[in-house]
């Protein structure tokens, strides 16, 4: 139960106080007592309910007839059952009794109010009052959790404006309420008692620029909606009538959590005595609603596909061809960013990141931003940010950043348990170096911080700075799979490559072609290259980064080997001995449910079958998935990239809901 | 082949900043390897910076690092050398030099390692 | 002080050769087969005439020639021509923490 005041009687005047229904009020009868008195007893009206304890051990009664010693061990507490209809109404009588004396009396008149501040704090997606019965200042993690919760009102609800809705203090129309949370001030008082009394709303300075909240006039419209609190307003004093009133407010938040905020906001109704207009208004009263705004959350490959995106670049027509027959099998949407655009930017993993933050009462797609800041640098504000579909950024957005910044670094894993650990939501993956060097690259801080900050998808570290992109999307992949864990890890494997070239070899096809059929690229006999001593060395160095990467994956996502499956891939190493992949990138593939998109590899044809599609297609078929091979030789490869580069997708969000888990 | 023609250098002050344009003609420079060299009055080449084709790596030689900034605009043909922080030392001659990365071996030559063209190059003269 | 040590000057009369050495460290020349070589004449840019130890771009005469043995590389330039006269500089990739190394640079005179 809440605590309300402490208040002191006194033998001399009646003392008037006011009891806001739901708390506990400690009642001081011993500090004025008359001083030959050894005892009391206390009456109250019907509405009141005394508490009498004295301790230790506690014996508690409730107030009768009963008379009890006077020292400093006996506690005296009030609570209201029903608010007043006029001030005063309710009345406690103390006598104070001595051996020698008659009884001396001491009144106390009582106006019970009902003030409640009421928030989703049971994560229903309805406000249900509470009766201050639960700790609204608390937010807890869990299925038995509680705490309200925010979203960030990042997406943009008015076409005509450039701005996420949260950058304005506006409240478009019910489409932009909807995006806040509801939060509720019940009052139920006297007539005349806000002629005495003020209520204010407040938030922590430290927290006022993080949120911002409107007052809703019931019955009207939502344009009537005015901001009372936000960030250059800390507190605001509220107009309530005297009488049984309910007041709306929506409340949005202006800021994800980071490193320097932890995304718990907090907004107090404080109960202020104004009657004495010759001193300070004093505080009786207050409660508070502790929401956490939503974090960011990524989708896993193994989340069902709703959009897929592509860029429209000089004679890649064949390839988006592919892409939008994979989407229709997919059932997807597809969306194509034209040349004008794109301004010959084709890399549409690396610009952004589609995730989704979600309340009770509304989920909403989000794209995060990177800060790479290339040819793509316009799409996601001007066309992927919009009506239900937020934007969030990080990172310098000039200068700063390395190759490790694009967001062909950054996956995440399909939900995992890890030595009994869950993590329903998966974990974060991104590419950093092994260790810090005067050129090693890394993930820029504020997006890791950020990352880490969302809480609940723990991020992992791998190492990808061997690679000349950097990309952990450049070795690694995850599918559906309908047994074990329900999702396979792909990993690029030269040491599968190799034992399947020379399986080759030794069938007699030591002469067929990588690269047949490709005009103006040298192509290379099966033999050749198994004797190539160099590329051998080359991939020997290779094998040992994506091993360490595949304990570090095994340890960190509680992966054993049969959960992992090696896709043939050479890779060859250019200047500074960084890795780049010698034929197109298989594991580099678009993943749309049971649909893959991989880049097709031109391997030796055997038999009038490419001996590595077959191979791939011998892992990958029997899980239920249905591999196409997209060419994407010219248009993608050979600029340093692959089908996965090229293509971003908005999945399914999370049936589970993030509030359910303990971080 | 590429032709390569360096701008933007010039007096300034110690402490202050330039950036360095090179800017490429005859061939797309998103297929080349790119480096700064330098060559104070009178003295010999000192290799400045490096970027790759792809724009997702770069080096730098330990008089510049933390000072000099080397990027690219694939889109504008042209690769940029911010220098800030300046000292009267860095007073050279500024050569913009490439290398080609569409290389066809099984194993690509360390064409990142020398330059195989390079531009007329422009005076950065730091003094007070 | 350079990385890479190249001799001052070397002087040749015309149809003669010469050899100008560049001698690194187990970290750069000695490690990589990444030497190259390169000419500049007075108020000119340098110009690549070896790469890879011993391999010539396009357009440079078979007179050039690069070699390599341990810590040293070599570049011998046969039947001295008038043009020959320049300034040649080798350069390595290092594991050090500047990866590119040039030398101090070599004055070639024809007599």
């Known amino acids: 139960m809440a605590q309300g005041t402490l208040i002191r009687v006194t033998p001399e005047q009646p003392t008037h106080a006011v009891c806001v229904l739901g708390t506990l009020t400690q009642l001081d009868i011993c500090s004025s007592a008359p001083e030959d008195c050894t005892s009391f007893s206390i009456n109250a009206s019907p509405g009141v309910v005394v508490d009498i304890a004295h301790g230790p051990p506690a014996k508690k009664k409730s107030t009768g007839s009963s008379t009890w010693p006077l020292d400093p061990g006996v506690e005296v507490t009030l609570t209201m059952k029903v608010a007043s209809g006029s001030t005063g109404d309710q009345k406690v009588q103390i006598s104070y009794y001595g051996p020698k004396t008659p009884p001396v009396k001491a009144l106390l008149y009582l106006t019970g109010v009902e003030i409640s501040l009421c928030a989703d704090i049971t994560r229903t997606g309805k406000v249900k009052p509470t009766r201050a019965v639960k700790d609204q200042r608390t937010w807890t993690w869990g299925p038995c959790g509680q705490g309200a919760i925010l979203l960030v009102n990042c997406d943009r609800d008015n076409l005509e404006s450039s701005a996420m809705d949260c950058e304005d203090d506006e409240v478009l129309d019910s489409e932009d309420l909807q995006d806040m949370s509801l939060m509720t001030l019940s009052t139920k008082t006297p007539k005349d008692f806000f002629t005495n009394h003020t209520l204010v709303l407040h938030v922590a300075r430290s927290e006022m620029d993080k949120v911002r909240v409107f007052q809703a006039t019931r019955g009207k419209l939502s344009s009537k909606c005015s901001v009372v609190l936000g960030p250059k307003w800390p507190s605001h004093y509220l107009m309530v009538p005297g009488g049984k009133h309910n007041m709306d407010f929506y409340v949005e938040a202006l800021a994800f959590p980071d490193t320097d905020f932890p995304g718990l906001i907090t907004l107090t109704i404080s109960l202020l005595d104004t009657s004495n207009l010759e001193l300070p208004e004093a505080v009786v009263f207050q409660d508070s609603v502790v929401f956490r705004v939503a974090p960011w959350i990524m989708t896993p490959n193994t989340q069902p596909p709703q959009e897929v995106y592509a860029c429209s670049i000089f004679e890649n027509e064949d390839f988006l061809k592919s892409v939008t027959t994979l989407a229709m099998k997919a059932k997807c949407k597809l969306t194509i960013c034209p040349e004008e655009e794109n301004m010959d930017d084709q890399w549409m993993q690396d610009e952004m990141e589609i995730g989704y933050i979600q309340a009770p009462h509304k989920t909403l797609p989000v794209v995060f931003d990177s800060p790479r800041n290339r040819g793509l640098k316009e799409f996601p504000i001007k066309r992927v940010m919009g009506p239900d579909f937020g934007y969030v950024t990080r990172g310098p957005q000039t200068g700063g950043i390395s190759g490790l910044d694009s967001f062909g670094n950054l996956e995440v894993s399909p939900p995992v348990t890890v030595r009994g650990k869950e993590y329903p939501l998966g974990r974060i993956l991104f590419g950093d170096s092994c260790y810090p060097s005067n050129d090693s690259r890394q993930m820029h801080q504020a997006l890791q911080d950020f990352l880490s900050a969302q809480q609940v998808q723990a991020p992992v570290k791998l190492y990808s700075d061997w690679l000349s992109v950097g990309h952990v999307d450049e070795f690694l992949s995850f599918v559906p799979a309908p047994d074990r864990k329900g999702f396979r890890l792909l990993l690029a494997s030269p040491r599968s490559c190799y034992k399947l070239f020379q399986e080759q070899q030794n069938e007699g096809h030591g002469e067929a072609l990588l690269f047949e059929g490709i005009k103006k690229k040298k192509q290379q006999k099966i033999k050749n290259i198994l004797s190539n001593k160099t590329l051998r060395e080359h991939n020997s160095f290779v094998e040992r980064c994506i091993d360490w990467n595949r304990e570090l994956l095994k340890r960190e996502l509680g992966l054993a080997e049969s959960d992992i499956i090696d896709i043939p891939q050479l890779f060859k190493l250019k200047e500074f001995s960084k890795a780049e992949a010698f034929f197109p990138n298989m594991v580099n593939m678009l993943v749309l449910g049971k649909h893959l998109g991989i880049p097709k590899p031109f391997g030796p044809v055997i038999n009038g079958r490419c001996c590595l599609e077959e191979k791939v297609c011998s892992l990958l078929e029997p899980l239920g998935l249905q591999c196409t091979f997209i060419n994407d030789f010219f248009t993608y490869h050979i600029r340093h990239g692959e089908v996965h580069c090229g293509t971003n997708v908005r999945r399914k969000p999370f049936s589970f809901k993030w509030w359910n888990m303990v971080p | 082949q590429v032709q390569l023609v360096e701008s933007g250098g010039g007096l300034v002050k110690p402490g202050g900043s330039l950036r360095l344009s090179c800017a490429a003609s005859?061939?797309?420079?998103?297929?080349?390897?790119v480096s700064w060299i330098r060559q104070a009055p009178g003295k010999g080449l000192e290799w400045v910076s490096f970027?790759?084709?792809?724009?997702?790596?770069?080096y730098y030689a330990d008089s510049v690092r933390g000072r000099f900034t080397i990027s690219r605009d694939n889109a504008k043909n042209s690769v940029y050398l911010q220098m800030n922080s300046l000292r009267a030392e860095d007073t050279a001659v500024y050569y913009c030099?490439?290398?080609?990365?569409?290389?066809?071996?099984?194993?690509?030559?360390?064409?990142?390692?020398?330059?195989?063209?390079w531009g007329r190059g422009t005076l950065v003269t730091v003094s007070s | 002080q350079s990385a890479l040590t190249q001799p001052r000057s070397v002087s040749g009369s015309p149809g003669q050769s010469v050899t100008i050495s560049c001698t690194g460290t187990s970290g750069d020349v000695g490690r990589y087969n990444h030497v190259s070589w390169y000419q500049q004449h007075p108020g000119k840019a340098p110009k690549l005439i070896i790469y890879?130890?011993?391999e010539r771009p396009s357009g440079v005469p078979d007179r050039f020639s690069g070699s390599k043995s341990g810590n040293t590389a070599s570049l011998t330039i046969s039947g001295l021509q008038a043009e020959d006269e320049a300034d040649y500089y080798c350069?390595?990739?290092?594991?050090?923490?500047?990866?590119?190394?040039f030398g101090g640079g070599t004055k070639l005179t024809v007599l």
């Open positions: 350069s390595s990739h290092s594991r050090s923490s500047t990866p590119v190394l």
């Open positions: 005859g061939s797309t420079l998103s297929d080349y390897f």
């Open positions: 030099s490439s290398a080609n990365d569409d290389v066809d071996d099984i194993v690509a030559p360390g064409r990142g390692y020398y330059m195989d063209v």
């Open positions: 970027i790759n084709s792809a724009n997702t790596f770069t």
């Open positions: 890879n130890v011993y």
